[in-house]
């Protein structure tokens, strides 16, 4: 299976860096977004703190921890009302992500 330049393999994501207009103060010059080529039944999500194609059921049911959003070695817990998740590091530090 050969891919054209710029074409993503099915089920993969890549991080794209966008250059901002440097004449605009207070706006970061570079920002990142994800470009995904998800298979049927998949939606772009987060796995191991990186963009990834995840099963659509995870998004529909809001079982965020099932997409393994935290880094290796971290624990994952759902927020109340399934509004997002927390990642707990071995040292106890907690990072919270909310889904809008």
């Amino acid at each position: 299976q050969f891919l054209k330049e710029g074409q993503l393999a099915a089920g993969t994501c890549e991080i794209v860096t966008l250059d901002r207009d440097s004449s605009q103060p207070r706006i970061e010059e570079r920002s990142q977004t994800a470009r995904c080529a998800c298979r049927k039944g998949q939606i772009a999500g987060t796995t191991r703190a990186r963009p990834a194609c995840v099963d659509a059921r995870i998004i529909k049911t809001k079982q965020w921890c099932d997409m393994l959003p935290c880094l290796e070695g971290e624990g994952c817990d759902l927020l109340i009302n399934r509004s997002g998740w927390t990642c707990t590091q071995p040292g106890g530090r907690i990072k919270t992500t909310t889904v809008s």
Partner: antibody
Amino acid sequence: QEQLVESGGRLVTPGTPLTLSCTASGFFLSGYYMSWVRQAPGKGLEWIGIIYPSGSTDYASWAKGRFTISKTSTTVDLKITTPTTEDTATYFCARVAGYVGYGYETFFDIWGPGTLVTVSL
Amino acid sequence: ELVMTQTPPSLSASVGETVRIRCLASEDIYSGISWYQQKPGKPPTLLIYGASNLESGVPPRFSGSGSGSDYTLTIGGVQAEDAATYYCLGGVTYSSTGTHLTFGAGTNVEIK
């Protein structure tokens, strides 16, 4: 150090339910998928099933109804609902890792030493 | 139901030879294959994941290749300590139809 240890294997009579436990140390179970695999004496490996952080499960077609996987914050349990002599095997608990790139292609990066279950009259 | 056909069931090789073990999946598994080594009385240990990625600490004489439904584990310059049974594991987790994982039947490698 990240490790898994199974327990609960013993001699049981056919039809007597048995629950095996897998205790994790060195990592959070909530950050991984976990699986059970078994190996009958002198035979190959058989995948039984998987449990996700949400607590939902999937099983091999042959294992549906015969096994139940559940978990707590520190253990993953496997219940053999109605053991038969064909269930005599070493049962392994394994941590599932995923190669991110093509979705959740799966491999087992940490295994427990196994626990032996003997089903006999 | 995913079927992983592993060949050969057993083989005998001399130290330094190249050994190849093949696993054929009954459907396209998108590089969702891993390879394990198991010695008697021990749990399996991971060698290769994602078809061709070498697990940390595994000697580079082990390599994996393949795509679609056809995959190969190669041991280049086999050593005495490589005598073991080797298994492939194929499948994909959390797909729209759930998780389907299947082990190959195993290949027993004997070193002459």
